[in-house]
């Protein structure tokens, strides 16, 4: 049998015309039923009964998942991060071949030197993080190695990350043109050969909240769109109130379909009220218009 | 666990003469780099005298001609000998050593150090 939804109706309006009971549990279309036990409900838009109630997908809610909710969760990560594959060549360090086990003691020695190096290089920069070598090779040593870069996610991180990556190809280019041999011998930390920089890679995280809220939104990926507050992007639908893209529906009720946000007006005891945003009454009484 | 043990270090009259010897344990001289820093009062730390195991040496300007620098490997030993000694002489004298070959005068570049020796030169 079919479940007995309690549903309490006010009389709205659709600013198309039509009357319309809220919330809109269609009592008069047949639904699927899904039975569990003596239960059953009527859980639309893929949504299950799990003994209780209905358990709604995304972008739904509500007895039956028959309404579509305002805003969505949208979780940026905390941080985002960026992975610059670099190669400087180290002259002040002969080549052997020890160097190319990660476990040798040579290994250990030659990182934590190249480690502090680079920590000294890059120190002016808040989103370092650090070095990682890869690979080192003869030459004397070609360190080929990912400098890290995180920053706290605001709309504006790949700028961040962006204007960073350039800080650090201009802080490797100065340090490998300026601690070089002399006859032989090196007085900084590390000696590099000049020419040995390059940049081979960025990597760059992505994170697109627009691209997040469309997926989320599915069939009404149209409809919603992403504002920020306080550098936080929230998903929301026109019938979200408090945002620049909110609707006021004035004397009457933010529903969305598929065809977007609609106004469902109000019928009060001694008014009517119309038009797209709700907003022209009309005194059952007099027939006056309020404007 | 790397260790260096440094000794003959003590008080000369200037023109004198002194051998410092540095003992190690934990790797072999076949191997990487050797040599000896000082450090004089108020003053940073200074290369002296570097070895790498492929031949490479470095004498400090104030010091070729004078101090020569040179290894045992059948007793793990480096050795600093200190001719015709300098007032400017006096300082510690340290013994440092790295697993990698090494070009540099940086102390900061040498990872494995002694506890130091001191030499003073006075009349």
């Known amino acids: 049998p079919l479940a007995t939804i309690p549903v309490s109706t006010t009389s709205l309006t659709s600013s198309e015309g039509s009357t319309i009971s809220t919330p809109s549990v269609d009592i008069s279309t047949p639904v699927t039923t899904s039975i569990v036990g003596d239960q059953c409900s009527r859980c639309k838009n893929g949504g299950f009964w799990d003994g209780l109630k209905c358990q709604c997908l995304t972008p739904y809610y509500g007895e039956s998942c028959e309404e579509v909710v305002n805003s969505i969760d949208i979780a940026p990560p905390e941080t985002v991060s960026a992975q610059m594959e670099l190669t400087v060549t180290v002259t002040s360090v002969k080549f052997t071949d020890e160097l190319k086990n990660h476990s040798s003691q040579e290994f250990r020695e030659f990182n934590k030197t190249f480690t502090e190096q680079m920590n000294i290089v890059y120190s002016g920069i808040p989103e370092y993080v650090g070095v990682n070598i890869t690979n080192l090779r003869l030459g004397s040593v070609v360190v080929e190695h990912d400098v890290l870069l995180r920053t706290k996610y605001t709309p504006e991180y790949k700028t961040a990350l962006d204007n960073a990556t350039e800080v650090v190809k201009q802080k490797i280019t100065k340090v490998t043109t300026e601690q070089i041999m002399t006859n032989d011998n090196c007085s900084a930390l590390m000696c590099f050969n000049t020419t040995g920089t390059q940049v081979q890679n960025i990597t760059v995280t992505q994170y697109d909240p627009v691209e997040e809220c469309r997926q989320k939104a599915e069939e009404y990926e149209d409809y919603f769109l992403v504002e920020y507050r306080d550098q936080k992007p929230y998903c929301i639908s026109p019938c979200e109130s408090g945002f620049n893209a909110s609707k006021n529906c004035n004397h009457g009720k933010c529903q969305m379909s598929q065809n977007g946000a609609r106004c469902l007006c109000v019928t009060t005891e001694t008014h009517w009220y119309s038009g797209e945003d709700c907003n022209q009454g009309t005194q059952k009484s007099h027939h006056h218009h309020h404007h | 666990e790397v260790q260096l043990v440094e000794s003959g270090g003590g008080v000369v009259q200037p023109g004198g003469s002194l051998r410092l010897s540095c003992a190690a344990s934990?790797?072999?001289?076949?191997?990487?780099?050797w040599g000896w820093f000082r450090q004089a009062p108020g003053k940073e730390r200074e290369a002296v005298a570097l070895?790498?195991?492929?031949?490479?040496?470095f004498y400090a300007d104030s010091v070729k001609g004078r101090f020569t620098i040179s290894q045992d490997n059948s007793k793990n030993t480096l050795y600093l000998q200190m001719n015709s000694l300098r007032a400017e002489d006096t300082a510690v004298y340290y013994c440092?050593?790295?697993?990698?070959?090494?070009?540099?005068?940086?102390?900061?570049?040498?990872?494995?150090w002694g506890q130091g020796t001191m030499v003073t030169v006075s009349s």
């Open positions: 440092a050593a790295s697993v990698l070959v090494l070009r540099t005068l940086n102390p900061k570049a040498w990872h494995h």
């Open positions: 070895i790498s195991s492929d031949g490479w040496t």
């Open positions: 934990g790797f072999t001289f076949s191997r990487g780099s």
